[in-house]
Interface confidence: low
């Protein structure tokens, strides 16, 4: 008889979740020599331990600490790229600019990117049917708490000039409720981070507005400045051209006009 199981509003755990995490871990540690010491079985055990047998609306950052410890990794100063609502372009950028890193270029972010997972209270089973939705069910669910935990850590360890890619096509270019706005911004360390440079990515080819003057960017500037961190903003008018110029900086058309610069 199939046992009764809680029905959540969100989609269930990604199929083959344990195998995917383990395979990603092995692949990552093979490609990144500085992480070769990581034991992927221990990583999976710590990941599993964070949510298996636990009520999926009562997960805490504490639950993920053993995993965070195992995945400890540092990014060189000036090489952190945060993003908000524009993941694909951020990832395309770091795939070309290999010395810059988003959270998903780090082990823990790489393991969990685009995956969903949850368990159930008092059973060792993974719930493949449904998982809590952040809005409709609860915010303290395994996926949301994971990203909050690793995002906080990623921001805390950043140093030098930190960059953030923001989506200029959205009504709120900077959204205080995004992971960037609610977690990362507040966990940059003023002693280590000299500046935050926002790259506002324009959507339309003909768009020549200065989105660095957008009220939400001004709000971001205010928050950052009050945290004793300097703020800069750049308009990236042609993201396609921008990426092309990152790939081929020698291209003669790349010497000017790629992105308008604003020093606030």
């Amino acid at each position: 008889v199939p046992r009764w199981r809680q029905q959540w509003s969100g989609s269930g755990t990604t199929s083959r979740f344990p195998e995917t995490v383990l395979a990603r871990c092995v692949k990552y540690t093979e490609v990144h020599p500085e992480m070769r010491h990581v034991d992927c079985q221990s990583v999976w055990d710590a990941f599993k331990g964070a949510f298996i047998s636990k009520y999926p609306c009562n997960i805490t950052e504490e639950d993920y600490q053993p995993l965070v410890k195992l995945g400890t990794q540092t990014v060189p100063c000036n090489k952190t790229l945060l993003w908000s609502r524009i993941k694909d372009l951020a990832h395309q950028f770091t795939q070309v600019q290999r010395d810059m890193f988003t959270l998903e270029d780090m082990l823990l972010g790489y393991l969990a990117d685009d995956l969903t997972w949850c368990g159930e209270f008092n059973t060792f089973e993974i719930n493949y049917q449904s998982c809590p939705d952040w809005r409709k069910d609860c915010s303290n669910n395994p996926v949301s708490v994971f990203w909050k935990t690793v995002s906080r850590r990623f921001a805390e360890t950043a140093c030098g000039v930190v960059h953030v890619m923001l989506n200029g096509s959205r009504s709120k270019i900077f959204d205080k409720n995004s992971t960037f706005g609610s977690v990362e911004v507040h966990n940059l360390q003023p002693e280590k981070v000299q500046a935050l440079e926002a790259w506002v990515i324009h959507g339309g080819r003909e768009d020549s507005r200065d989105l660095c003057q957008d009220p939400t960017i001004k709000e971001l500037e205010s928050i950052i400045s009050k945290r004793n961190i300097r703020f800069f903003c750049k308009n990236i008018y042609r993201p396609d051209k921008f990426l092309q110029c990152v790939k081929n900086p020698e291209d003669s058309s790349c010497l000017s006009g790629i992105h308008h610069h604003h020093h606030h």
Partner: antibody, heavy 115, light 107 residues
């Protein structure tokens, strides 16, 4: 290492104003916000407000709103704190400070308000 | 505004003993917390910043720990010159806020 050097002690009459200066050396002046903190005799430390010179952006503690003005002159790397409508309770040591690696403090300026 | 609460208000300790001072923030300040020592008639002296980093020239007997909302300053073996008032301060956000101070006195 950043050094913050403040102007000398002042004796003021009630109702008047005082302007204390804070000159920074080392580091980029416009980059790091400067805060002003005061300590009345036998009391704790209280933040009055701050400025980010590069933006001219200021923030004041509610308690001092309307009475304090913080400004900065980038050309001389100097921040100023002016407190108006002085009363005897404003007798205190006034410090400028900023986060820069650690937290650097000026040596303090004693302002005495007395009739 | 973030409220910083220090405990105890007064700590009586004998020279050579260990002193543990606590500071609690009303909301998370990450690790943007400093500790100061102040003696009568003197300016505050920065001991610890970043919750656990000793400022230049501060003896190793002073150590700081904690993050988020709970912080501790430990003086491993009190010397006569350590008897003073100690303040914690958050600088995570303006307005900077300070604890009310803990007076460490000779027992």
């Amino acid at each position: 290492q950043v050094q913050l050097v403040q102007s000398g002690a002042e004796v003021k009459k009630p109702g008047s104003s005082v302007k204390v200066s804070c000159k920074a050396s080392g580091g980029v002046f416009s980059q790091f916000p400067i805060s002003w903190v005061r300590q009345a005799p036998g009391q704790g430390l209280e933040w009055m407000g701050g400025i980010i010179a590069g933006y001219g952006a200021t923030e004041y503690a509610q308690k001092f709103q309307g009475r304090v003005t913080i400004t900065a002159d980038e050309s001389t790397s100097t921040a100023y704190m002016e407190l108006s409508s002085l009363r005897s309770e404003d007798t205190a040591v006034y410090y400028c400070a900023r986060v820069y690696g650690g937290i650097d403090w000026g040596q303090g300026t004693l302002v005495t308000v007395s009739s | 505004e973030i409220v910083m609460t220090q405990s105890p208000a007064t700590l009586s300790v004998s020279p050579g003993e260990r002193a543990t001072l606590s500071c609690r923030a009303s909301q998370s300040v990450s690790s943007n917390l400093a500790w100061y020592q102040q003696k009568p008639g003197q300016a505050p002296r920065l001991l610890i910043y970043g919750a656990s980093t000793r400022a230049t020239g501060i003896p190793a007997r002073f150590s700081g720990s904690g993050s988020g909302t709970e912080f501790t300053l430990t003086i491993s073996s009190l010397q006569s010159e350590d008897f003073a008032v100690y303040y914690c301060q958050q600088y995570n956000n303006w307005p900077w806020t300070f604890g009310q101070g803990t007076k460490v006195e000779i027992k």
